[in-house]
């Protein structure tokens, strides 16, 4: 999950395995101030999971969340 550095949440590691799409309710990008670009998925249990925006499944999920 993202760590807050000076109130800006940043990710220092990514999950590589796909999360169940049905478990994800929203997402956000971490700040450009962070050293690693990342997408943070928020699950239906309100857990925040850092993901690599270059992964295919991550891009696919972002697209479907945008459309829903």
């Amino acid at each position: 999950s993202p760590h807050a550095s000076d109130t800006t949440p940043c990710c220092f590691a990514y999950i590589a395995r796909p999360l169940p799409r049905a478990h994800i309710k929203e997402y956000f990008y971490t700040s450009g101030k962070c050293s690693n670009p990342a997408v943070v998925f928020v699950t239906r249990k309100n857990r925040q999971v850092c993901a690599n925006p270059e992964k295919k499944w991550v891009r696919e999920y972002i697209n479907s969340l945008e459309m829903s």
């Epitope: 590589a16 395995r17 249990k45 295919k56």
Partner: antibody
Framework: QVQLVQSGAEVKKPGASVKVSCKVS????????MHWVRQAPGKGLEWMGG????????IYAQKFQGRVTMTEDTSTDTAYMELSSLRSEDTAVYYC????????????WGQGTTVTVSS | SYVLTQPPSVSVAPGQTARITCGGN??????VHWYQQKPGQAPVLVVY???DRPSGIPERFSGSNSGNTATLTISRVEAGDEADYYC???????????FGGGTKLTVLG
């Protein structure tokens, strides 16, 4: 080195249940996703379900929903797969598999457990 | 649900190149993993994320993914490569892992 060691072969009667265990060594069970895959004689691989650690939830293949239960005992680093209402078509080798090395794929597999359903 | 189609069998002479295909609708949008399974043994991951190779897997194994077809290529085929090969993807519509039906690679001679 990560290893998965499964319980021994089982012979069951139709209608019974079977519980297969998968003991993890080399890492903590809760860190990674544990999945179960089966293979009927002469057939291909079939995913049954798995645990999603980020979520704390288990997901099941629709085909097995209501008939399979996957659990984990973190105190012994052992995963379990229980399949109920067995029928002859459930005769298969059952594998546990996980992703500690190349996440997003099943990089480590157990040796397999043969389950035979016969009257 | 998502369907992966593999040829049941592929035959190749030792030293030649074997290509095993895995077909799926717009499969290039998915990460494809490949497993090798020898008789009586558990599957072994040989390629992940379309084209990456786990450590310990020879460079002779490579993967590609474009359009509706992913391909596992085994160059300079050896007798020890004879096995069943399975492709695998994550189907986000059903939240299921899906395997192809498998391809039996026979090394002639």
């Amino acid at each position: 080195q990560v290893q998965l060691v499964q319980s021994g072969a089982e012979v069951k009667k139709p209608g019974a249940s079977v519980k297969v265990s998968c003991k993890v060594s080399g890492y903590t069970l809760t860190e990674f996703a544990m999945h179960w895959v089966r293979q009927a004689p002469g057939k291909g691989l079939e995913w049954m379900g798995g645990f999603v650690p980020e979520d704390g939830e288990t997901i099941y293949a629709q085909k097995f929903q209501g008939r399979v239960t996957m659990t984990e005992d973190t105190s012994t680093d052992t995963a379990y797969m229980e399949l109920s209402s067995l029928r002859s078509e459930d005769t298969a080798v059952y594998y546990c598999a996980t992703d500690p090395l190349y996440e997003g794929s099943f990089s480590v597999w157990g040796q397999g457990t043969t389950v035979t359903v016969s009257s | 649900s998502y369907v992966l189609t593999q040829p049941p069998s592929v035959s190749v002479a030792p030293g030649q190149t074997a290509r095993i295909t895995c077909g799926g609708n717009n499969i290039e949008s998915k990460s494809v993993h490949w497993y090798q399974q020898k008789p009586g043994q558990a599957p072994v991951l040989v390629v992940y994320d379309d084209s990456d190779r786990p450590s310990g897997i020879p460079e002779r194994f490579s993967g590609s993914n474009s359009g509706n077809t992913a391909t596992l290529t085994i160059s300079r085929v050896e007798a020890g490569d004879e096995a069943d090969y399975y492709c695998q993807v994550w189907d986000s519509n059903t939240d299921h892992w899906v395997f192809g039906g498998g391809t039996k690679l026979t090394v002639l001679g």
